[in-house]
Interface confidence: low
């Protein structure tokens, strides 16, 4: 019995179906086929879970969180024992193993391993201003999304014809910050943060209004 090489890892957007491949060759009939799919979740590597089981011509559910979401892609028994997972969740990220036994065919590699990563688009980021908006001050524009896998990068842009930040601005696309030094009236305007990762984009807006000093009465 020989389980074929798997692609190594699969990425899927949260909520979308995933197919985890596992095929094998055997010299025996499929009368005594026994297939166990296990997962070692990324979130809890010490706690492997059973995903689905095929034994004695019957299918059995694995861990409760997979109930109703998992099945074999084809009619069993077969030499293609790939499974699908519907409505993938973040907690489905992990290393999946198919263990195949088909007596009396023993020996050879009977395990296939596939990594599954569930990707999450950036959630609506939160935009805020830190610091005084008085002319001549330094301000920091902050942007962060609560969710996003892979971790989002953040791009700030000023929504005018140039789409460029003021020349006094420095941007950190990993932290989602923009520092604008010595703000002037020209720094005023609408700024947008674009949070993006491999599968999605989200935005938030803020309006920076630079405050000019009020003329003083001399009396």
């Amino acid at each position: 019995l020989e389980v074929s090489e798997s692609p190594g890892s699969i990425q899927v957007a949260r909520g979308q179906p995933a197919v985890l491949p596992c095929t094998f060759t055997t010299s025996a009939a499929l009368i005594n086929l026994n297939v166990i799919w296990m997962v070692t979740p990324l979130s809890n590597a010490n706690q492997p879970e059973q995903v689905i089981l095929y034994q004695g011509g019957q299918m059995f559910d694995g861990a409760p969180r997979f109930h109703g979401r998992v099945g074999f892609t084809g009619t069993m028994p077969a030499t293609n024992v790939s499974i699908f997972i519907n409505n993938t969740q973040l907690s489905d990220t992990g290393t999946y193993q198919c263990l195949v036994n088909n007596l009396p065919d023993i020996g050879g590699r009977n395990i296939g391993v596939t990594g599954l990563t569930v990707l999450v688009p950036p959630s609506a980021p939160h935009c805020q201003i830190q610091g005084s908006q008085d002319i001549g001050s330094d301000v920091i524009l902050l942007c962060s999304s609560e969710e996003g896998i892979p971790r989002p990068t953040y791009l700030w842009e000023k929504l005018d014809n140039t789409l460029k930040l003021p020349p006094t601005a420095t941007q950190d696309q990993v932290q989602g910050t923009v520092t604008i030094r010595n703000i002037s009236a020209l720094s005023s305007g609408l700024y947008q943060c674009v949070a993006s990762n491999a599968i999605g984009t989200s935005t938030c807006l803020l309006d920076l209004q630079v405050i000019s000093p009020q003329p003083r009465n001399i009396g």
């Epitope: 959630s123 984009t201 935005t203 807006l205 309006d207």
Partner: antibody, heavy 123, light 111 residues
Amino acid sequence: QVQLVQSGAEVKKPGASVKVSCKASGYTFTGYYMHWVRQAPGQGLEWMGWINPNSGGTNYAQKFQGRVTMTRDTSISTAYMELSRLRSDDTAVYYCARDPDGSGGSSRWFDPWGQGTLVTVSS
Amino acid sequence: QPVLTQSPSASASLGASVKLTCTLSSGHTNYAIAWRQQQPGKAPRYLMLLNSDGSHTRGGGIPDRFSGSSSGAERYLTISSLQSEDEADYYCMIWHNNAWVFGGGTKLAVL
């Protein structure tokens, strides 16, 4: 393409509540704030508040505090706006409107709105 | 809370030009605004973003007959070569403290 489809017209009695739904499609529902705006017959636009579909966090206009509740169901990409203790001056078209997307330049900017839901409050 | 003031009505002849005004309240004169158009029986649609320095960018599909300019607290929307479908309500709006603020709107009649 991006679409916001709202529930149908409602007729309510004063003192009752109304719940308007807004089903989003064509984009990541949790990626953009959803606003609610109303327009009384022959009048201007009035912002009511927003909901962050990701966290469920809300921000209501002061005028509607205590009477409006905005919720969402992310499993069906739908936002809801419920207005209670209805009065005759709540008769209006209620719009849901997604936060703008200016990514890549504001020439591509668009902020889709629903088709509007007419709520009539009459005894 | 900022206030946006618009003239309730305006009119101009077919093929002519018209300039609509939105005035920002004192203390908010640096704000960028958006202009929106609402044709009868339809939802408002985005026309353009207009910065305090007068730079503006139209939304996708908005013809270049629509242009914007700024002067101090005033934000202008100019529509040239007026067409019958330009008869509509025009609103200015800003973003302020995580909220949207709308002007009262100007009803444009094309004669």
